[in-house]
Structures are given as structure tokens and as C-alpha cells.
């Protein structure tokens, strides 16, 4: 069985380094990938709670 990419990463992992243009931070494996590999972010509905701090080019749902 392959180990998960986050098996050794705890909650105190350092904040992500900002991704280069055309890359987005994959929050589930904790590294930058081509934005096209992630789901297309859906626009937040009006009145929804504010998004989390964008410490990287993090896709917002």
C-alpha cells in the first residue's frame, strides 16, 4: 500500500509557500499543482461566510 502524501504531516506543518502563476495549492496533499488538476472552484453564494485566508493560490469553493 502506498503511504498517503500527508501521513507524516501534522497540524503544525509550515504555511504553504505561495504557488507560482498557473499553479494552485492543493490543500489535500499540501503542495502546489497545476490549477487545471483541481476542481473548478464554485462561486461563493452571496451572504456566505468569508473564505479562509488565502495563504497561497488556494482554490475557493
Amino acid at each position: 500500500m502506498r503511504r498517503g502524501p500527508r501521513s507524516l504531516r501534522g497540524r503544525d506543518a509550515p504555511a504553504p509557500t505561495p504557488c507560482v502563476p498557473a499553479e494552485c495549492f492543493d490543500l489535500l496533499v499540501r503542495h502546489c499543482v497545476a490549477c487545471g488538476l483541481l476542481r473548478t472552484p464554485r462561486p461563493k453564494p452571496a451572504g456566505a461566510s468569508s473564505p479562509a485566508p488565502r495563504t497561497a493560490l488556494q482554490p475557493q469553493e
Epitope: R2, G4, P5, R6, S7, R9, R11, A13, A15, P16, D26, L27, L28, V29, R30, V33, G36, L37, L38, R39, P41, S49, A52, P53, T55, Q58, P59, E61
Partner: antibody, heavy 117, light 111 residues
């Protein structure tokens, strides 16, 4: 709109094998994460594992390498190969696709796997 | 693995009641300022339905009587005024660390 359709469930004897399929439409399985979740009769949800955009897989360690997730990008379908099946693997198996945060907002209808002699 | 413990396991309530379900994680599910905690509703014979993601964000199309709160290890799902269609089983889930794990479920029954 994303649609997920599972198939391949059925009755299998203990020690046998089965391959479940999840055909996705509305998005490419080369983007995002694609999951299997199961639910034994009358029990709660149990995460089985995922395959992501790069083909990387991760499994619930409790399954002890008996299950393998793979994909066929030409068919936009991903699979759950289950070997050395046991009675306790009897469950409804769902495929699901999550947000970028892991929350699963698209689910298939489920396919029942019964392991019995 | 992160263990998810829901309470209560079941509850009886009436239409119009305010219902609160709690979920406690064995360690923090927060990272990068985000709580990787989600809530689902499931009715018999049906696939789960996502209600709340990222601890407090309401999924599109879900009624506003559902809300989520919490951070770190302690989270709450609240139904402000229980409706007949809300009688179901509710699950929390964390996706902060592999393997992703669910709570054992809370069944909301009619009193």
C-alpha cells in the same frame, strides 16, 4: 452536473474477488479526487480510499492492502478491486467526488456487495 | 488515525425543535486556517448528502436552518427548527489527515 454511476456489485463467496466500477460524467477523472466509501448494513460510513488527478492512491489502512483503486482515463471510469473478501466486507459501496477541501458533494447511487457462502 | 466521536448517538425530537449534534476529533483538524470538517445527512436507502463543509460553510441548496460551527477538535451541527424531512442520520467527517474518517453517526428520530 457531475453524475457517478457504480456497477459490479453482487454476491461473492468468502475469499473471492470483485471489481466495482464508477463511471463519471460531467467532469474528467484527471481532475480532483475520486473516492470510494462503504456502508455495512445498519452501520455507519467508512472511507475506503481515493485516487487523485495524478493517479496517486491512498487507502484506509484497516483494509490491509486487499483493496486497490485504479482508473481508465479513456473511459472516465475508476475502479475498486477487492480481493480476499470477507463477510465483514458486505456493504453498499459508494463512489464520491469531493470539493477541494475533501467534502464529498457528488455521490453515486451505491452498489451492494454481499460476501456469503 | 483521527478518531471522530459524535454525540448523542441518537435523539428524539419534535418538529420545530432546535437540535444540536456535536463531533469531537481526537486531534485538531485545522490547518492553514481551515477546519477540514464536514457534515452529511443520510436517509435510509439513499446516498449521503453534504450539508456543511469546512466546519461552517453551507452547501449550495441546503436550507439555512442548518448551520455548523467550531474549530480545532470540537464541532457542532445545529438545526434551528426541525422539519419533517430532517429526520435522518447525520455524520461528521474529517479530511485533515489520511485516512479520512467519519463519526459513527447520530440518528434523529421523531418524538
Amino acid at each position: 452536473e457531475v453524475q457517478l454511476v457504480e456497477s459490479g456489485g453482487g454476491l461473492v463467496q468468502p475469499g473471492g474477488s470483485l471489481r466495482l466500477s464508477c463511471a463519471a460524467s460531467g467532469d474528467s477523472i484527471t481532475r480532483g479526487y475520486w473516492n470510494w466509501v462503504r456502508q455495512a448494513p445498519g452501520k455507519g460510513l467508512e472511507w475506503v480510499g481515493y485516487i487523485n488527478y495524478s493517479g496517486t492512491t491512498y487507502y484506509n489502512p484497516s483494509l490491509k492492502s486487499r483493496f486497490t483503486i485504479s482508473r481508465d482515463t479513456s473511459k472516465n471510469t475508476f475502479y475498486l478491486q477487492m480481493n480476499s473478501l470477507r463477510a465483514e466486507d458486505t456493504a453498499v459501496y459508494y463512489c464520491a467526488r469531493p470539493h477541494n477541501y475533501g467534502a464529498m458533494d457528488y455521490w453515486g447511487q451505491g452498489t451492494l456487495v454481499t460476501v456469503s457462502s | 488515525d483521527i478518531q471522530m466521536t459524535q454525540s448523542p448517538s441518537s435523539l428524539s425530537a419534535s418538529v420545530g425543535d432546535r437540535v444540536t449534534i456535536t463531533c469531537r476529533a481526537s486531534e485538531s483538524v485545522d490547518d492553514y486556517g481551515i477546519s477540514f470538517m464536514h457534515w452529511y445527512q443520510q436517509k435510509p436507502g439513499k446516498a449521503p448528502k453534504l450539508l456543511i463543509y469546512r466546519a461552517s460553510d453551507l452547501e449550495s441548496g441546503v436550507p439555512s436552518r442548518f448551520s455548523g460551527s467550531g474549530s480545532g477538535t470540537d464541532f457542532t451541527l445545529t438545526i434551528s427548527s426541525l422539519q419533517p424531512e430532517d429526520f435522518a442520520t447525520y455524520y461528521c467527517q474529517q479530511t485533515s489527515k489520511d485516512p479520512w474518517t467519519f463519526g459513527q453517526g447520530t440518528k434523529v428520530e421523531i418524538k
